[in-house]
Interface confidence: medium
Amino acid sequence: EEELQVIQPDKSVLVAAGETATLRCTATSLIPVGPIQWFRGAGPGRELIYNQKEGHFPRVTTVSDLTKRNNMDFSIRIGNITPADAGTYYCVKFRKGSPDDVEFKSGAGTELSVRAKPSAPVVSGPAARATPQHTVSFTCESHGFSPRDITLKWFKNGNELSDFQTNVDPVGESVSYSIHSTAKVVLTREDVHSQVICEVAHVTLQGDPLRGTANLSETIRVPPTLEVTQQPVRAENQVNVTCQVRKFYPQRLQLTWLENGNVSRTETASTVTENKDGTYNWMSWLLVNVSAHRDDVKLTCQVEHDGQPAVSKSHDLKVSAHPKEQGSNTAAENTGSNERNIY
């Protein structure tokens, strides 16, 4: 009688993560008597996957009923496949022995490859805000995919970026892989509404790439421009001075009025107007009682924006031309908030 052969007809099997893998194996004879075992890998370190003789293998089911007489189909199904299951599986026939069964013949092996989807890309920007014209770095990470081949692209507002570096790890064979990419982006004053997008394409995604986004509003700081102007006199001895704070982002801003270097009033930007580009404008004004001054007054609008060092703009107020009003020692009226802010 012809010697038993163990036939594994599939050289390779490709399965998506979470699905069931079928590993086929048949024997050409019932003789010699003895069980079939399945292993992952070869050699001394091989891992037992299924033993027909004994043991508990909750993820493994046999394709046919192995208790049926004359059964020679020893195919198995492995459920809930993960990338960690990838490897070469061998169907091995043992000859019944005492006390131990003896390995008789092995199949040629079936390589199980697992297709696993990449995780949703996570895009992270710099820890601190940066101002326009500066170059900032964004990172994109995605994990757990297999096979290794993957494509990553960067976009800013739909325009593809070219200044980036990408690594897929590990370099050698692995059950699953990770991708890490760093892109450099030059900020402009118009970037408050801008988005940076990392797009990952993989065979498991069937042409529908995964995207991760970062809003540049989290990254950019647009410093304000200041303009201090003197408005027409509201009363015979009063002058209205405004400080226009324009094109700033984010909104966090504190303004201090100084009269000849002395703090007159401090306020925080609350109700602001938003520009189309996402930056903000704000105006503060000060009523100066010129009759309280014998000399010219230097008015300074000092702005501290988003925790940065203060910037300021000054205005020299000429008071010699105005008559002095006796009995008044008030240099400036601290007006109500809705008077002081001009919208």
């Epitope: 008597v33 069980p35 027909q52 003789k53 192995l66 059964n71």
Partner: antibody, heavy 126, light 105 residues
Framework: VTLDESGGGLQTPGGALSLVCKAS????????MGWVRQAPGKGLEFVAA???????EYGAAVQGRATISRDNGQSTVRLQLNNLRAEDTGIYFC?????????????????????WGHGTEVIVSS | AVTQPASVSANPGETVKITCSGS????YGWYQQKSPGSAPVTLI????KRPSNIPSRFSGSKSGSTATLTITGVQADDEAVYYC???????????FGAGTTLTVL
Amino acid sequence: VTLDESGGGLQTPGGALSLVCKASGFTFSSFNMGWVRQAPGKGLEFVAAIYSGNSAEYGAAVQGRATISRDNGQSTVRLQLNNLRAEDTGIYFCAKDAGSGCYSGVCAGTSSIDAWGHGTEVIVSS
Amino acid sequence: AVTQPASVSANPGETVKITCSGSSSGSYGWYQQKSPGSAPVTLIYETNKRPSNIPSRFSGSKSGSTATLTITGVQADDEAVYYCGSEDSSTYLSIFGAGTTLTVL
């Protein structure tokens, strides 16, 4: 189905015996055949079986001393037992398997017997 | 090894279950011997198959590595030694259990 054993009797220790089972009433070549024995006052003990492809199995007590063979033309199965011991004394039954081949990757000759002979007595004594 | 109880007893008409613990992957046979040295009779082979000449009150089943012979409506004539046969779970060698003596009270 009829199974007739022969060849028993008084045997001397260290000697050899040859038991023959003549089968009739079924297609002999299609079925596994075996031998089971029972020592005085003891239970049943598997001795040997021969399967469809002439693959043989032997019980632990006779391993290395027994040879089972079959002649499909004569519808006979033979058990040769060498180096006889006193503990080989007992009644030897010929047994027919319910089928051919194996299941579960194993041919368990004791789980699928569907017919028995009446037995032949073997006494090993000096 | 194949393990079965040494003895069981029952009143006529009762149901008797005799268990046999052995291999989880193999099948089981059940054999009745009325007297020592007499030819055994096959009641069940391949775990649950009954020869045509055996009454239906004899049935076999298996759960995990334990097989059960069930005799419903036990009769006085059922007094005998019952052997289970299977394979040794470690060596795969074909073996018999030590036998279970059924006494009908």
